[in-house]
C-alpha cells in the first residue's frame, strides 16, 4: 500500500489577520508530503498546496471569495515522491480542521496612526484604513469597507509628562480631542469589533506616536 508509512496531520490551526488566512498543522514531514483541501459547508472540495513539504498553506485566495461563509479544510498525507495515479483507490490519511468563519474570526491587524494635527486646543488624530485582500469587482476593499460600523477605534492619549491615560472612541477613522495648550501628547489606537464576544475582539495597540515628531502638525 502506498500510504502505510504516512502519518495523519494534527493540530490543524487557522491563523488569520485582516483576512490573510493560513492553515498550519503538524508534524514536520519525514518522508511524506501534504495536500490541503478547503470547502464551504455546502460546496465542493478544492485542492490547494499540492504535495507540499511545508506545514502551512495560504488559503486567503479561497476565503476572500466570501468572508461571511464558514469554511472547513482537511490535510491529506502522502508518501514523499508521491505521484497521483488513476488506479489508486486507497484514501490517504487526513485530518479535518476546525470550522473557520473569517468575518467572525479573523484577527484585527495592528492599526497605524496616519497623522495628527493640532489646532489650538484640539487635536485631530487619523487612523490609516488598512487594505485587505477582499475584493469587490476588481477593487481591493479596506477593513472599513468590509466591517463598516461593526468596526470602531479606541484612542489612548496622555501627556508626555505624565502616565495618566484618557480614552476616546470613534466609528470613523478620525478622533477630535481636547488637549491642554502648550502640552505635548502621545497617542496609541486599537481597532475593536464590539459585536464580537471572543479574544479576537480587539487588535494589538498601534505604535505610539507623540507630538513634536514628524507625523504631527501644529497650527495656532
Amino acid at each position: 500500500s502506498g500510504t502505510t508509512n504516512t502519518v495523519a496531520a494534527y493540530n490543524l490551526t487557522w491563523k488569520s489577520t485582516n483576512f490573510k488566512t493560513i492553515l498550519e498543522w503538524e508534524p514536520k514531514p519525514i518522508n511524506q508530503v501534504y495536500t490541503v483541501q478547503i470547502s464551504t459547508k455546502s460546496g465542493d472540495w478544492k485542492s490547494k498546496c499540492f504535495y507540499t513539504a511545508d506545514t502551512e498553506c495560504d488559503l486567503t485566495d479561497e476565503i476572500v471569495k466570501d468572508v461571511k461563509q464558514t469554511y472547513l479544510a482537511r490535510v491529506f498525507s502522502y508518501p514523499a515522491g508521491h505521484v497521483e495515479s488513476t488506479g489508486s483507490t486507497e484514501e490517504p490519511p487526513y485530518e479535518n480542521s476546525p470550522e473557520f468563519t473569517p468575518y467572525l474570526e479573523t484577527n484585527l491587524g495592528q492599526p497605524t496612526i496616519q497623522s495628527f494635527e493640532q489646532v489650538g486646543t484640539k487635536v485631530n488624530v487619523t487612523v490609516q484604513d488598512e487594505w485587505t485582500l477582499v475584493r469587490r469587482n476588481d477593487t481591493f476593499l479596506s477593513l472599513r469597507d468590509v466591517f463598516g460600523k461593526d468596526l470602531i477605534y479606541t484612542l489612548y492619549y496622555w501627556k508626555s509628562s505624565s502616565s495618566g491615560k484618557k480614552t476616546a472612541k470613534t466609528n470613523t477613522n478620525e478622533f477630535l480631542i481636547d488637549v491642554d495648550k502648550g502640552e505635548n501628547y502621545c497617542f496609541s489606537v486599537q481597532a475593536v469589533i464590539p459585536s464580537r464576544r471572543t479574544a479576537n475582539r480587539k487588535s494589538t495597540d498601534s505604535p505610539v506616536e507623540c507630538m513634536g515628531h514628524e507625523k504631527g502638525e501644529s497650527r495656532e
Epitope: K68, Q69, T70, T101, Y103, L104, T126, V127, D129, R136, L141, S142, L143, R144, D145, V146, F147, G148, K149, D150, L151, N171, T172, N173, E174, P194, S195, R196, R197, T198
Partner: antibody
Framework: EVQLVQSGAEVKKPGESLRISCKGS????????IEWVRQMPGKGLEWMGD????????NYSPSFQGHVTISADKSISTAYLQWSSLKASDTAMYYC?????????????WGQGTLVTVSS | DIVMTQTPLSLPVTPGEPASISCKSS????????????LTWYLQKPGQSPQLLIY???TRESGVPDRFSGSGSGTDFTLKISRVEAEDVGVYYC?????????FGQGTKLEIK
C-alpha cells in the same frame, strides 16, 4: 436563494406578551445582521434594532430600548422580536431584514412582514 | 441621533419624465477611512416590503434598473430616476446607515400623473 420568512399575523390584548420570528435561509445566518423595522399604519419606516446571530450582539434604537427584546437562535437560523407587555401603540407591521454583504451596505433582503394588532 | 429630511414628500410624475428626490442628513455620512458615504435608498411599492435600491450613496444594488442613480456626499444626497415607469410608484426612503441608531427619512410618495 436568500429568504427571510416571518411568522404570521397576531391579534393581542394590551398587557399581553408576544414573540414574533424571522427565519433566514440560503445564506450563512451567523455572519449577517438581522434588522427589525416598524411601520405603523399609514406611516414611514422606523429602525428598532438589530442582532448579529453569531455573537448575540444587539443594538437598539433609544425609542425602542427597554420595550422590546431582540434575540436569535443560530441553531435554527431564526431571529426574534418580543414584547413583555404590549400597548395599543404597538399596532404595526414589523419587518425583519438582512444586512448586505459589505459594511454599511443597507438592508439587502426583507421578510414579508408580520402584522401585529393590539386592541382591547 | 442623525435626522434625515426628504423633499418633496409627494412627487407626481408623468411616465417617461425624470424625477428627483432630495435627502439631507443632520450630520455628515462620509466615512473618513474609506471616503464612502453611508446613505441608502429604498423603495416600498404599494402592499409590499421595502426593497434596497442604492447603497454607499451611489452604488446600485444588483438587479436594480440603471434608470435609478444616486449622488451626493456629506449631508446632501439625491436619488434620480431618469425616465419614470408605472412600476416605480411607491414610497422612497433614504436611510442613515452610518452610525447607530440607524434612521430613515420620512418618505417621498411617487405617483403617476
Amino acid at each position: 436563494e436568500v429568504q427571510l420568512v416571518q411568522s404570521g399575523a397576531e391579534v393581542k390584548k394590551p398587557g399581553e406578551s408576544l414573540r414574533i420570528s424571522c427565519k433566514g435561509s440560503g445564506y450563512t445566518f451567523i455572519t449577517y445582521w438581522i434588522e427589525w423595522v416598524r411601520q405603523m399604519p399609514g406611516k414611514g419606516l422606523e429602525w428598532m434594532g438589530d442582532i448579529l446571530p453569531g455573537s448575540g450582539s444587539t443594538n437598539y434604537s433609544p425609542s425602542f430600548q427597554g420595550h422590546v427584546t431582540i434575540s436569535a437562535d443560530k441553531s435554527i437560523s431564526t431571529a426574534y422580536l418580543q414584547w413583555s407587555s404590549l400597548k395599543a401603540s404597538d399596532t404595526a407591521m414589523y419587518y425583519c431584514a438582512r444586512s448586505g454583504y459589505y459594511g454599511n451596505s443597507g438592508f439587502a433582503y426583507w421578510g414579508q412582514g408580520t402584522l401585529v394588532t393590539v386592541s382591547s | 441621533d442623525i435626522v434625515m429630511t426628504q423633499t418633496p414628500l409627494s412627487l407626481p410624475v408623468t411616465p417617461g419624465e425624470p424625477a428627483s428626490i432630495s435627502c439631507k442628513s443632520s450630520q455628515s455620512l462620509l466615512s473618513s477611512g474609506n471616503q464612502k458615504n453611508y446613505l441608502t435608498w429604498y423603495l416600498q411599492k404599494p402592499g409590499q416590503s421595502p426593497q434596497l435600491l442604492i447603497y454607499w450613496a451611489s452604488t446600485r444594488e444588483s438587479g436594480v434598473p440603471d434608470r435609478f442613480s444616486g449622488s451626493g456626499s456629506g449631508t446632501d444626497f439625491t436619488l434620480k430616476i431618469s425616465r419614470v415607469e408605472a412600476e416605480d410608484v411607491g414610497v422612497y426612503y433614504c436611510q442613515n446607515d452610518y452610525t447607530y441608531p440607524l434612521t430613515f427619512g420620512q418618505g417621498t410618495k411617487l405617483e403617476i400623473k
